[in-house]
């Protein structure tokens, strides 16, 4: 089930998924001056089973000026380049997909992809928040949001994060002081689709990753 809305916006913060649930789609978008080639895909789709998940399809971009020049297909992990992002650039440490069953890791970049990635999340997806450069995190609880299904409608939980304007950068989970335990979440309903175990696995997984801020847009 696709999440109807985007994750909540927190002033002076960005969010990122550490892993993507099966069913997540990523649009194949190209940067200005480039277009999707006809033999390239419309989207990538996270598929798999309990033991292995991966992204189906390839995104490919070509110059809008030329009709027959195709650009590099989705590279293999060892060919990954540093991601060009809107705000900051930071290398990403690959995560073993098997470390979180039923999830795909961040897809590697493709040449001339758009600056912002358009993901379509599914129910159960968790995203983590981080204050942007120049702002410091004040936590009341976990700096995360989960897409849940409640009474037939999807909604994102509210992350317990405030970013204050002090010149200090906070990190994604695992790179700062431990946050409140998942039991401490101010959630009243019992329809949560992400279990404590899921949270623990994702937090442990997040701890293995370097800071990586991608500005992501949703449609």
């Amino acid at each position: 089930e696709l999440c109807d809305d985007d994750p909540p916006e927190i002033p002076h913060a960005t969010f990122k998924a550490m892993a993507y649930k099966e069913g997540t789609m990523l649009n194949c978008e190209c940067k200005r001056g480039f277009r999707r080639i006809k033999s390239g895909s419309l989207y990538m789709l996270c598929t798999g089973n309990s033991s292995h998940s991966s992204w189906d399809n390839q995104c490919q971009c070509t110059s809008s000026a030329t009709r027959n020049t195709t650009k590099q297909v989705t590279p293999q992990p060892e060919e990954q380049k540093e991601r060009k992002t809107t705000e900051m650039q930071s290398p990403m440490q690959p995560v073993d997909q098997a470390s979180l069953p039923g999830h795909c890791r961040e897809p590697p970049p493709w040449e001339n992809e758009a600056t912002e990635r358009i993901y379509h999340f599914v129910v159960g997806q968790m995203v983590y928040y981080q204050c942007v450069q120049g702002y410091r995190a004040l936590h009341r609880g976990p700096a995360e949001s989960v897409c849940k299904m409640t009474h037939g409608k999807t909604r994102w939980t509210q992350p317990q994060l405030i970013c204050t304007g002090e010149m200090e950068t906070s990190q994604f989970p695992g790179e700062e002081k431990p946050q409140a335990s998942p039991e401490g979440r101010p959630e009243s309903e019992t329809s949560c689709l992400v279990t404590t175990t899921d949270f623990q696995i994702q937090t442990e997984m997040a701890a293995t990753m370097e800071t990586s801020i991608f500005t992501t847009e949703y449609q």
Partner: antibody, heavy 113, light 107 residues
Framework: DVQLVESGGGLVQPGGSRKLSCAAS????????MHWVRQAPEKGLEWVAY????????YYADRVRGRFTISRDNPKNTLFLEMTSLRSEDTAMYYC??????WGQGTLVTVST | DILMTQSPSSMSVSLGDTVTITCHAS??????IVWLQQKPGKSFKGLIY???NLEDGVPSRFSGSGSGADYSLTISSLESEDFADYYC?????????FGGGTKLEIK
């Protein structure tokens, strides 16, 4: 250019079986999920089945689940649809498709006595 | 399953006319929709993807719009080659589902 060519259609008796093939070229077949879609005579389109690039994930329409099997041979760039226990309502033109912009010409399956 | 309700099912129009075909999804599909064209006795051609993006090589008289659960395909200044069947398909979730189709006929 992407090319998809279906084959294997024909006249089948009710209760019989048939295996359709779709030969793909012009793209890296082994990295793309693939679909089978059908169109009954003078009717609209009906999605039949999907298989992920590495065959780890398959989805079927309720009407064919348990009777149809989608599979693929990546080294041979070929997609398959094995159909068993065929019924008259399975009569249709069967198309293979790759994320909706690229379709084959179709192969006609007629289930009749 | 997501139900795609396409309208009209058929329409008689004249060369040069502008026509709009709509598809309503039973739930939001976040622009995960393709518009297809099928000419008599032929296969399918993708015209619009992600709701609004024109496929390379498709004439600019075709355009797509919409968001949430409601989407439309507009063909301005109809040409003779545009008389065909048109379908929408959603790829937001499995099972993939199609609109019932619209037949464009010459008046």
């Amino acid at each position: 250019d992407v090319q998809l060519v279906e084959s294997g259609g024909g006249l089948v008796q009710p209760g019989g079986s048939r295996k359709l093939s779709c030969a793909a070229s012009g793209f890296t077949f082994s990295t793309f999920g693939m679909h089978w879609v059908r169109q009954a005579p003078e009717k609209g389109l009906e999605w039949v089945a999907y298989i992920s690039s590495g065959s780890s994930t398959v989805y079927y329409a309720d009407r064919v689940r348990g009777r149809f099997t989608i599979s693929r041979d990546n080294p041979k760039n070929t997609l398959f649809l094995e159909m068993t226990s065929l019924r008259s309502e399975d009569t249709a033109m069967y198309y293979c498709a790759r994320d909706w912009m690229n379709w084959g010409q179709g192969t006609l399956v007629t289930v009749s006595t | 399953d997501i139900l795609m309700t396409q309208s009209p099912s058929s329409m008689s129009v004249s060369l040069g006319d502008t026509v709009t075909i709509t598809c309503h999804a039973s739930q939001g599909i976040r622009s995960n929709i393709v518009w297809l064209q099928q000419k008599p006795g032929k296969s399918f051609k993708g015209l619009i993807y992600h709701g609004t993006n024109l496929e390379d090589g498709v004439p600019s008289r075709f355009s797509g719009s919409g968001s949430g659960a409601d989407y439309s395909l507009t063909i301005s200044s109809l040409e003779s080659e545009d008389f065909a069947d048109y379908y929408c398909v959603q790829y937001a979730q499995f099972p993939r589902t199609f609109g019932g189709g619209t037949k464009l006929e010459i008046k």
